[in-house]
Amino acid sequence: QNSQLREDLLALRQNFSNLTVSTEDQVKALSTQGSSVGRKMKLVESKLEKQQKDLTEDHSSLLLHVKQLVSDVRSLSCQMAAFRGNGSERTCCPINWVEYEGSCYWFSSSVRPWTEADKYCQLENAHLVVVTSRDEQNFLQRHMGPLNTWIGLTDQNGPWKWVDGTDYETGFQNWRPEQPDNWYGHGLGGGEDCAHFTTDGRWNDDVCRRPYRWVCETKLDKAN
């Protein structure tokens, strides 16, 4: 009886040991599988995130293109209307010009003296830019970058005057400290009679013969 019990006990122990080993192996296998599944899920997750990011970027890019297309179509149809009309009214900006607050602006990529820059603007039925507010100043700075750039302000004929007749004394001014100074020390003859944006956006008077970039401006007519 005793020996039978001993045998049964041994058998049970063996079974239990086998079961434990088997269970441990299964747990290990499941754990490995779990890790593998986890890794795969992370991979899928990161792929999905990347695809979502790419789609979002594509969507944003597409929106920008659509906006640009709409703008171009509007501009072209307006150009066509202007072309068909007698050209006396302008309700949209010419191609390559930037619209802001009811005016069109053209930013040069080359340099020339103030007088030549002013003549260029006149040929475009425009004038050198007249800066009338801090907002306009900021807009211009954003588009110009930190470059010396002529504006439509000169005292070649006496007092400082804007080229379009805007009152200088009561209007917006943004001179650098100690400017204008009509400096004669440059050795180029005469003083300094033409105003320009300096690299920080504030104004300075300089020799009109210096070749700087320039900005043209023309007002938009209100559409009927």
């Epitope: 050209g87 191609i95 053209w106 040069s108 990529s109 080359s110 260029y120 006149q122 040929l123 039925n125």
Partner: nanobody, 116 residues
């Protein structure tokens, strides 16, 4: 590629006339104001004359006013400069250009020599 080809230069006596032409290609000619500039030997570049896109507005340097006439033919993509009453001081290489462009959009130029 933008191309500007000047022609019509040459040797002329003082008081004589010349007509310069500039054939443009590689861009929409009618979309740009155009100009003539010149460079005399050993001197800097001088803007001579400019013309608006449609040809309705022109400007001239004081030194050529009343003697030179700028014109354009948008159907032929061509810019012209009629030069009358030429003087020795008009001797220079004459360039045509898209107005407002950088110097890489200028032609090779045509030499005008005014001499007796």
């Amino acid at each position: 590629e933008v191309q500007l080809l000047e022609s019509g230069g040459g040797l002329v006596q003082p008081g004589g006339s010349l007509r310069l032409s500039c054939a443009a290609s590689g861009f929409t000619f009618a979309d740009y104001p155009m100009e003539w500039a010149r460079q005399a030997p050993g001197k800097g570049l001088e803007w001579v004359s400019g013309i608006s896109r449609d040809g309705s507005r022109t400007y001239y340097a004081d030194s050529v006013k009343g003697r030179f006439t700028i014109s354009r033919d948008n159907s032929k993509n061509t810019l012209y400069l009629q030069m009358n009453s030429l003087r020795a001081e008009d001797t220079a290489v004459y360039y045509c250009a898209k107005m407002g462009s950088n110097f890489d959009y200028w032609g090779q130029g045509t030499l005008v020599t005014v001499s007796s």
